[in-house]
Amino acid sequence: KESCDVQLYIKRQSEHSILAGDPFELECPVKYCANRPHVTWCKLNGTTCVKLEDRQTSWKEEKNISFFILHFEPVLPNDNGSYRCSANFQSNLIESHSTTLYVTDVKSASERPSKDEMASRPWLLY
């Protein structure tokens, strides 16, 4: 029998390599059984996760899972960093793994590094 606890499906140590100026949607996949929980995004600052209050978010519903989306329109260099989503469920706070955005500000698409290069060249990142 599947658990009816809320589950947040962000992979541990997940990373996204994205380009400043582009739109980007950061998804927090949420599984729940009955009432949809209240979900928020925060950005890690050292060991503290600072709640993102005034950011555009939305829900996308699919058959077996819902997605709480943090919108970047557009991505800015200072969006670089690690993010976490959290759900309030029956007075419990459930936290996802953090996911890291690596933002690069190259001038043209032809200069964009590959995902592998992004992972191995942190000096490219803001």
Epitope: Q7, L8, Y9, I10, K11, R12, S14, E15, H16, S17, T47, E95, H97, S98, K115, D116, A119
Partner: antibody, heavy 119, light 112 residues
Framework: EVQLVESGGGLVQPGGSLKLSCATS????????IHWVRQASGKGLEWIGR????????KYAASFKGRATISADDSKNTAYLQLNSLKTEDTAVYYC????????????WGQGTLVTVSS | DIVMTQSPDSLAVSLGERATINCKSS???????????LNWLQQKPGQSPKRLIY???KLDSGVPDRFSGSGSGTDFTLTISSLQAEDLAVYYC?????????FGQGTKLEIK
């Protein structure tokens, strides 16, 4: 039934390349990280790197950076390891392993495929 | 890179007796999420590795409860409470807290 089946091993000339496949079934590859690990005869396990099939992000051990490429095709539930500039010391059994990325709920290993680098 | 050092390199234990394998990491494996990503793998002769234990002490499904894992920070232990003939294998610890992920050198468990 969960399965990881590696293929593509065999005899390769020094300086040559190989591309190994890891066909998975019984789970959604996008929910996992795919690792490639090798083991020379009578030796221990050596981590080559890992791929996130959900977005293509890849990490490598330093000794394989620039020489190894790990990728995945989630539509085929299959992962790949390409290794270039092969040397005799690359002779080993190559394993793929699939570890669930969210809650560590499973960690499956394939049976391995033997690669022999020799002239 | 994090160095994982297992002891002993080999171990001979009588059937029904307790077997203990140690694994020491060169730095803490405690992740920033408060969890410790330390696995134990079993590799029987001629077979591929199999995950026995993850997150230091959680047993994979189907793993007999004579296996247990313990430890924290940099020091970890795999214990087999009552050795069975089918436990003859090489055991590896593996950390996947810090990149690059690294294995211990392995401990060969033999029947005395």
């Amino acid at each position: 039934e969960v399965q990881l089946v590696e293929s593509g091993g065999g005899l390769v000339q020094p300086g040559g390349s190989l591309k190994l496949s890891c066909a998975t079934s019984g789970f959604n590859i996008k929910d996992t990280y795919i690792h490639w690990v090798r083991q020379a005869s009578g030796k221990g396990l050596e981590w080559i790197g890992r791929n996130d099939p959900a977005n293509g992000n890849t990490k490598y051990a330093a000794s394989f950076k620039g020489r190894a490429t790990i990728s995945a095709d989630d539509s085929k539930n299959t992962a790949y390891l390409q290794l270039n500039s092969l040397k005799t010391e690359d002779t080993a059994v190559y394993y793929c392993a699939s570890y669930e990325g969210y809650y560590e709920r499973f960690g499956y290993w394939g049976q391995g495929t033997l690669v022999t680098v020799s002239s | 890179d994090i160095v994982m050092t297992q002891s002993p390199d080999s171990l001979a234990v009588s059937l029904g007796e307790r077997a203990t394998i140690n694994c020491k990491s060169s730095q803490s494996l405690l992740d920033r999420d408060g969890k410790t990503y330390l696995n134990w793998l079993q590799q029987k002769p001629g077979q591929s590795p199999k995950r026995l234990i993850y997150l230091v002490s959680k047993l994979d499904s189907g793993v007999p409860d004579r296996f247990s894992g313990s430890g924290s920070g940099t020091d970890f232990t795999l214990t087999i409470s009552s050795l069975q003939a089918e436990d003859l294998a090489v055991y590896y610890c593996w950390q996947d807290t810090h990149f690059p992920y690294t294995f211990g050198q392995g401990t060969k468990l033999e029947i005395k």
